[in-house]
């Protein structure tokens, strides 16, 4: 799996989308987990409704919500009031029994709020994990990078 980068601004909400084959994963609940440590386990953050037919209902765990469009094949995770310590590597998972298939590896990057002058540029980012040669950045609009294309001009 390549890793997809989602960038959000501290204090705001970030939506992460994980597309999947709706037929292949028919009847399966989904989950959102966080990678602990460089080689550690993926710790469950939130999962969809216990009844698969009700997967469209948004479920919250703290500031993280999950909802599943089982017909369209898109799992959506919302991180509300994004914080610096939300940065890191996550996975969207499809559950079957005690097993979990990885739908997408996600790197969440948290950027300082450019309008918040009190904390401007005063944000810790702990880094990224895992190799992703063909990753792409997703803000509110997603697109894949073309080969050899520079993703974004450096910003400060």
């Amino acid at each position: 799996h390549n890793t997809t980068v989602f960038q959000g601004v501290a204090g705001q909400s970030l939506q992460v989308s994980c597309p999947y084959d709706s037929m292949k994963h028919w009847g399966r609940r989904k989950a959102w987990c966080r990678q602990l440590g460089e080689k550690g386990p993926c710790q469950r953050v939130v999962s969809t409704h216990n009844l698969w037919l009700l997967s469209f209902l948004r479920r919250w765990n703290g500031s993280t919500a999950i909802t599943d469009d089982t017909l369209g094949g898109t799992l959506t995770i919302t991180l509300r009031n994004l914080q610096p310590h939300d940065a890191g590597l996550y996975q969207c998972q499809s559950l079957h029994g005690s097993e979990a298939d990885t739908l997408r590896k996600v790197l969440v990057e948290v950027l300082a709020d450019p309008l918040d002058h009190r904390d401007a540029g005063d944000l810790w980012f702990p880094g990224e994990s895992e190799s992703f040669e063909d990753a792409h950045v997703e803000h509110s609009i997603s697109r894949s990078l073309l080969e050899g294309e520079i993703p974004f001009p450096p910003t400060s």
Partner: antibody, heavy 120, light 107 residues
């Protein structure tokens, strides 16, 4: 194995600029952010900022805002930290550090450090 | 900024001793705390992350505990190579901040 090799020691005059390099090897450079941390002689550690090696986004410590610029060259897997308008209290060992992969963690791998001395 | 206060600032101990270093945050940081070891002229080395998780390759004599504002690093049986300065670091909010350090010296 992962290695971060920094440029050599520098002696600068007050008001000058310094640019420290950090060449990474042993891993996919664009998969891990780089943070810069400094340590004045006999003092503790101070975080300076972070740069995304993937797209160049940066977050800087407020104290250094306007004086520091962090950049990367993905073709050579090298990160750079430039500090301008140097003062005597910028005399320190400057470290680059590889991001760890999750907010639960901190910095796994560090460069050997670059001593920057600011003196007239 | 969150202030991190380490104590003691230095401790004299002998090989085989149990050494405890504490770190207090000026506000709650959940378990977002790391511990580093630094030897003279060397870069810091990560020992513990997430307050209690042992970094790969670090000897099991090192352990971390705590949550909220109070944290502890314990070296169960001090070894010659453990004489160094230890720093705590909060990874909860911006910017990340370090404790002032605790120097573990030979008695």
């Amino acid at each position: 194995q992962v290695q971060l090799v920094q440029s050599g020691a520098e002696v600068k005059k007050p008001g000058a600029s310094v640019k420290v390099s950090c060449k990474a090897s042993g891993y996919t450079f664009t998969s891990y952010g780089i943070s810069w941390v400094r340590q004045a002689p006999g003092q503790g550690l101070e975080w300076m900022g972070w740069i995304s090696t993937y797209n160049g986004n940066t977050n800087y410590a407020q104290k250094l805002q306007g004086r520091v610029t962090m950049t990367t060259d993905t073709s050579t897997s090298t990160a750079y930290m430039e500090l301008r308008s140097l003062r005597s209290d910028d005399t320190a060992v400057y470290y680059c550090a590889r991001g760890s992969g999750s907010g639960y963690d901190s910095w796994y791998d560090w460069g050997q450090g670059t001593l920057v001395t600011v003196s007239s | 900024d969150i202030q991190m206060t380490q104590s003691p600032s230095s401790v004299s101990a002998s090989v085989g001793d149990r050494v405890t270093i504490t770190c207090r945050a000026s506000q709650g940081i959940d378990s977002w705390l790391a511990w580093y070891q630094q030897k003279p002229g060397k870069a810091p080395k990560l020992l513990i992350y997430a307050a209690s998780s042992l970094q790969s390759g670090v000897p099991s004599r090192f352990s971390g505990s705590g949550s909220g504002t109070d944290f502890t690093l314990t070296i169960s049986s001090l070894q010659p190579e453990d004489f160094a300065t230890y720093y705590c670091q909060q990874a909860y909010s911006l910017p990340p901040t370090f404790g002032g350090g605790t120097k573990v010296e030979i008695k």
